[in-house]
Interface confidence: low
């Protein structure tokens, strides 16, 4: 007949498994429950997809590796006390006293609760690395920890090549022994130790779960460490960089971390699972029975099959592990688990010129003599394109690319973003937002879903801010609708007169000329440069101030560069800012200082892009790595990254005006990258590609 | 409850620098618009300038190129700077909040801070 | 720069009376966006102004029911209808319609 065989890790598992399948059949449990032994929870998820075995209950970290790596899937969750439900939070505390924040957590000495842990170490660990705070290079999540903090107590660090600093705040027990053990040995062990190493003042943080403040404060501890510490005297930090009482944990934590879970193979019925278990759990749950399904004390250990703090286990309605494990515990892990032995010794950087070769070469041999991990290649392509076949192919690992590339590459070959360039802030050149101005005095005021019959002035054609965004924008939302891809004659006729220089003037429609004005001698007329007064940012914003048009597609720099007394040009010289608005997609006008809020899109800055299956966080740490040596323009280290005068060229792998290779955060698809509105725009012009 | 304190020397000679600092508590000035507002002996209210949350300014044109504001996010303090002060500049200095919630009407000002001019 | 013009410049009052005070913008102070921008204030002796009244006739949080605003294009009312000693001061409006924003010379509220 039909039978549950159940996954064993230790000799005490397996003889309280057997107990439990004892129980289970003395009762008329239908399936029979079987006792598989493996010798660790990896070796029976392996045992599991190989059809060995069929269930195991498993913690979040390693229900992320069965689902991702075998295809199992979580089906009956564990619940522990009632507030929470299927899961804790894991919380970073500090004293209130401090100014410590999310953001500021370099060089601050913290308490961990052990190598290994969830709260105390792969949650805050993972998040600081998925964020982007915390960079990695070839995997070494040690060293990159120890060289983050100030110092640590992280108790099971000992043998670890950092002890020095992971065990430097620990001080084992009353007489100075078990320093650093992962037992109680050590003082600053487990949830109440890592908590009592922040309130002694040895750290400045503590990564503990929700309910460790509030169990260990206002006279509910014993020991005399605790007794006359207030709750009040602590903080939680929160992902947006703020702080919050120790109460507001929902709102206010790293992660949620799931409870366990028993997981089982994609092809298991985890509704027969549920229906063992729970048949189970009604009959051998409570204080008395013959069997205790969520008491391990009489095998002399803890948390053997379920965790002893197990109230009831409840079905999982979606049965997959991302869904299970939520987001914000998700990308911890995806932070977190990086195999050495499964890190490719090269990344192939692809080159498209022979002075970027040079560059490239210059770059491998600089981060070759740092020891940096992994080391570049330089693989030549002939195009962008070229690039993204071959690192599609897997021939090549990455490459830095402009926005509509990045599109390309992400649309058409998959790729995904794993660091971006970040400018200086005031460098609007390379990073800007596109946006609609108007005349704020327009006694007929119009939103931007009302253009159609407007005149309007625009940059130049194929100009990202004055043609390709906007027009593509009208396009996508529908109100430009071209006929047999000529988007020419759409725009011409959408709006009633306009002004877009061109170069190339041939079938160009003659409503797109009409607002221009040439030089000053009439002369030039709709000339794609600076003879036409009305071209470029400067001159569309010019068009319209001089009335010649209603709308102008300009950077959101453009209306502060030539107003209050910026640009002296007898046109701009009177010109106040708050005499213009913006036209938000949302149909609003708004002050020109919201453009963060109400534009068309935001240019977005460079991204290195690589496959899917790549880590990125491996691509990132070594950037950063390299960034710190190598990264200012005038470092002594023998190679600049975000230079390429020395090579006769611009922008050679990187941009020039790069100050920082940045984390993609959360931004980790071309979409999320992009932003929605400038993704929507390409595809407004990408749709006219016949 | 929204604080605005304003702080600096209250003697300047001419043709010198006046600073100002406005510290700010109970809101950030990364929202909403941050201002400098003057009240000569005699009455008169002139407005002087600000800077918004996005670190655009906007000065009275009648100070012409002698303003200057300036912030400091970290502090949550925004500045003032007037340069080659005359007898003229004598006068109480505000600074006071604008927000969306009172249509920028001026809701919570500074205790201000008087500066005389002279030599 | 938008003129406005606040009379009388003192206003004599008994405690309990009705006071009125008036101001005029040199030009009309209604946004195209259909808004009108004119605010009063109060300046006690010794103190820094407050925000009495948004936008012609809205009153700010904490300010007393006897406080009223009216007024449209360029004339503006200010009514307080019973004075209290607590009144005593400098009234001020301010039009912000227009760039940069403008103040009315004043209004001495003070007892006969």
């Known amino acids: 007949g039909m039978e549950v065989r159940w996954c064993a890790t230790s000799d005490p598992e397996q003889h309280k498994c057997g107990n439990m399948s004892e129980a289970f059949r003395e009762a008329g449990i239908q399936p029979s429950l079987l006792c598989v032994r493996g010798t660790s929870a990896d070796h029976c998820v392996q045992l599991i997809a190989a059809q060995e075995a069929d269930a195991i209950t498993l913690d979040g970290g390693a229900i992320y590796e069965a689902g991702k790596e075998h295809g199992l899937k979580p089906v009956v969750g564990e619940v522990y006390d009632q507030e929470v439900g299927t899961s804790y939070y894991a919380v970073a505390v500090v004293r209130r006293s401090s100014h410590v924040t999310i953001d500021t957590l370099k060089g601050v000495k913290s308490c961990h609760t052990g190598i290994n842990r969830t709260v105390g170490w792969n949650v805050p660990v993972g998040y600081l690395v998925e964020s982007g705070r915390l960079s990695v290079m070839g995997c070494d999540v040690l060293k990159a920890v120890s060289d983050y903090f100030g110092g640590s107590c992280v108790p099971g660090a000992g043998e670890t090549s950092y002890s020095e600093s992971l065990c430097r705040l620990c001080r084992g027990d009353s007489s100075g022994e078990g320093v650093c053990d992962k037992s109680p040995l050590e003082r600053y062990y487990d949830y109440s130790g890592a908590f009592r190493c922040l309130a002694e003042g040895a750290g400045d943080v503590a990564f503990v779960k929700h309910s460790t403040v509030l169990e260990n404060t206002d006279g509910k501890t014993l020991p005399s460490w605790g007794q006359a510490l207030l709750s009040q005297d602590f903080e939680l930090l929160c992902r947006d960089g703020s702080r919050a009482d120790v109460t507001e944990w929902r709102q206010c934590h790293l992660a949620r971390v799931p409870a366990h879970a028993v997981v089982v193979r994609a092809d298991t019925d985890g509704g027969l699972i549920f229906r063992l278990l729970n048949e189970g759990q009604r009959l051998f749950s409570h204080e008395g029975s013959s069997f205790q399904m969520f008491s391990s004390e009489a095998y002399g250990q803890k948390d053997l099959l379920f965790k002893d703090s197990t109230s009831e286990l409840v079905p999982i309605a979606t049965q997959t592990y991302e869904a299970w494990l939520g987001h914000e515990y998700l990308h911890a892990m995806k932070g977190l688990l990086c195999d050495p032995n499964r890190l490719p010794p090269y990344l192939r950087w692809c080159v498209l010129s022979t002075p970027e070769i040079q560059k490239c070469g210059d770059m491998a041999v600089a981060f070759r003599r740092q020891r940096l991990k992994p080391e570049i290649q330089c693989v030549s392509a002939k195009s962008p394109q070229h690039c993204m076949e071959r690192i599609q192919a897997e021939q090549v690992d990455a490459v830095t690319l402009s926005g509509e590339d990045i599109y390309t590459a992400g649309k058409t070959y998959g790729l995904v973003p794993a660091a971006g360039e970040h400018y200086a802030p005031e460098d609007s050149s390379n990073s800007y937002y596109v946006v609609a101005v108007v005349r704020r005095d327009s006694s007929h005021a119009f939103t931007l879903d009302e253009l159609r019959g407007k005149r309007s002035c625009h940059a130049g054609f194929g100009s990202p801010a004055g043609w390709d965004v906007p027009v593509g924008a009208l396009i996508q939302r529908g109100f430009i609708r071209p006929k047999d891809c000529d988007v020419l004659t759409a725009v011409s006729e959408f709006f009633n007169a306009s002004c877009v220089p061109v170069n190339n003037p041939k079938n160009y429609p003659s409503s797109l000329c009409a607002l221009c004005v040439g030089d000053e001698q009439g002369r030039n007329k709709c000339v794609g440069n600076s003879q036409e007064r009305y071209y470029g940012y400067r001159g569309a914003f010019r068009c319209l101030v001089e009335n010649a048009g209603d709308v102008a597609f300009v950077r959101h720099t453009t209306v502060f560069d030539n107003t209050n007394g910026h640009n002296s040009e007898p046109w701009a010289a009177e010109l106040r800012s708050e005499d213009y608005e913006l036209l938000c997609p949302n149909g609003a006008r708004a002050e020109v200082s919201q453009f963060a809020a109400c534009n068309l899109a935001q240019i977005p800055p460079h991204a290195v892009m690589v496959r899917p299956d790549t880590n990125i966080f491996t691509v990132y740490g070594l950037l950063d790595k390299a960034q710190d040596l190598f990264g200012d323009d005038h470092n002594k280290n023998g190679f600049k990254m975000f230079d390429s005068s020395n090579y006769h060229g611009q922008d050679l792998l990187f941009k020039d005006a790069t100050v920082r290779a940045v984390p993609v955060g959360e931004k980790t698809t071309y979409r999320g990258w992009l932003g929605l509105d400038y993704v929507a725009a390409l595809e407004g012009m990408s749709s006219q590609q016949c | 409850e929204v604080q605005l304190q304003e702080s600096g020397p209250s003697l300047v000679k001419p043709s010198q620098t006046l600073s100002l600092t406005c510290s700010v508590t109970g809101d950030s000035i990364t929202s909403g618009y941050w201002n400098w507002i003057r009240k000569f002996p005699g009455n008169k209210l002139e407005y002087m300038g600000y800077?918004?949350?996005?670190?655009?300014?906007y000065y009275n044109p009648s100070l012409k190129s002698r303003i200057s504001i300036t912030r400091d996010t970290s502090k949550n303090q925004y500045y003032l700077q007037l340069n080659f002060v005359t007898a003229e500049d004598t006068a109480t200095y505000y600074c006071?909040?604008?927000?969306?919630?009172?249509?920028?009407?001026?809701?919570?000002w500074g205790q201000g801070t008087s500066v005389t001019v002279s030599s | 720069d938008f003129v406005m013009t606040q009379t009388p410049l003192s206003l004599p009052v008994s405690l309990g009376d009705q006071a009125s005070i008036s101001c005029r913008a040199s030009?009309?102070?209604?946004?195209?966006?259909?808004?009108?921008?004119l605010h009063w204030y109060l300046q006690k002796p010794g103190q820094s102004p407050k925000l009495l009244i948004y936008r012609v006739s809205n009153r700010f949080s904490g300010v007393p029911d006897r406080f009223s605003g009216s007024g449209s294009g360029t004339d503006f009312t200010l009514k307080i209808s019973r004075v209290e000693a607590e009144d005593l001061g400098v009234y001020f409006c301010s039009q912000s319609t227009h760039v940069p924003p403008t103040f009315g010379g004043g209004t001495k509220l003070e007892i006969k």
């Open positions: 006071a909040r604008r927000t969306l919630a009172t249509y920028y009407a001026m809701d919570y």
């Open positions: 800077i918004s949350d996005s670190g655009i300014t």
């Open positions: 030009q009309s102070l209604v946004h195209s966006n259909g808004n009108t921008y």
